[in-house]
Amino acid sequence: SVTVHSSEPEVRIPENNPVKLSCAYSGFSSPRVEWKFDQGDTTRLVCYNNKITASYEDRVTFLPTGITFKSVTREDTGTYTCMVSEEGGNSYGEVKVKLIVLVPPSKPTVNIPSSATIGNRAVLTCSEQDGSPPSEYTWFKDGIVMPTNPKSTRAFSNSSYVLNPTTGELVFDPLSASDTGEYSCEARNGYGTPMTSNAVRMEAVERNVGV
């Protein structure tokens, strides 16, 4: 019987470092090895018939035990599939190796209205583009961490908001007078130093009533 396996199905490595993606196989007399890269809608062949393809040959080397990168970039994050078949036969096996290239978060950008109307919906956003794996976001009001559930802390029990740590979106619905304050957010991805945005003041103002 044939086996194709990797003892490291997930590899996390800081950007600009070398890395090896392992692929061990047995039961093939004349193995033909291919490596495929998948990331979202992108699929690329890294290795075909035991040879590194032209787009990778300057920085990837084929070994009998895997492929080795001289230096990885954030664009290399994705799933690599090692596919082994018998030359001229029908034996086949494959193994997937997930590569996560670690990049610390950059300073997040916030979109916070300087004023918003009490009783209305107010949307605050926080995002950063560099972090790999993607960052999770924490919001602060006047320097105090905002819990995911406002009812869980006395300081925020009068607020009505939904906070999504994955997207960084903070939605007040409805906005109340007590939501006035200075807001900032922090991005962290478990690698490098967490980064904090600028603080922006939001005023919760009464609805203008026409005379």
Epitope: S7, I13, V19, S26, T61, P64, T65, K70
Partner: antibody
């Protein structure tokens, strides 16, 4: 014939650093990752980390992270394991082992004694 | 991380006895288990990989079986030269050894 030959026994004081070598022959050094395994007296085997000699990439077990450094010299087909800030608990036999998927060939072991 | 629980930690058996050692993984390891023999003052020696594949030159009295999380190593007829400590190694996801089983002759 595949062979992994390690350097001789070492006696070190607490706080010191030890560097052990593992010279290979009988195969292409850069084709296989080289691992290091610790065995304290009367105890079991514990994986420490490895190096890919082709590109110098390393991975370390959490327990040893920050104290262990594994390197390789492809000009001499030799792998090295350096352990710093030694303490009495580091008294052990250290093995290098070649990885195919599992560990198929091992060095003879190097005894490191940490004693004041 | 995957943990490997090996039992018994030691056993005493007579020459010719059937000896069984077990290793239980904390999760499915997909048959990626190897067994090693270590004699005093020597490096571990690979006997079996991928649950049951015997290394070249290893006597057929050694065998391995199992699947999922439960694996067994057997010496069908214990010989004096089999006195050693035996270790399992999972290599499905990184590398973890069992605690070892010391085999002695009664």
């Amino acid at each position: 014939e595949v062979q992994l030959v390690q350097s001789g026994a070492e006696v070190k004081k607490p706080g010191a650093t030890v560097k052990i070598s593992c010279k290979v022959s009988g195969y292409s050094f850069t084709d296989y990752s080289m691992h290091w395994v610790q065995q304290a007296p009367g105890k079991g085997l514990e994986w420490m980390g490895y190096i890919d000699p082709y590109n110098g990439g390393t991975r370390y077990a959490e327990k040893f992270q920050g104290r262990v450094t594994i390197t390789a010299d492809t000009s001499t087909d030799t792998a090295y394991m350096e352990l710093s800030s030694l303490r009495s608990e580091d008294t052990a036999v250290y093995y290098c082992a070649r990885q195919t998927d599992y560990f198929d060939y091992w060095g003879q072991g190097t005894l490191v004694t940490v004693s004041s | 991380d995957i943990q490997m629980t090996q039992s018994p930690s030691s056993l005493s058996a007579s020459v010719g006895d059937r000896v069984t050692i077990t290793c239980q993984a904390s999760q499915d390891i997909n048959n990626y288990i190897a067994w090693y023999q270590q004699k005093p003052g020597k490096a571990p020696k690979l006997l079996i990989h991928y649950t049951s594949t015997l290394e070249t030159g290893v006597p057929s009295r050694f065998s391995g079986s199992g699947s999922g999380t439960d694996y067994t190593f057997t010496i069908s007829s214990l010989q004096p030269e089999d006195i050693a400590t035996y270790y399992c190694l999972q290599y499905d996801n990184l590398w973890t050894f069992g605690q070892g089983t010391k085999v002695e002759i009664k």
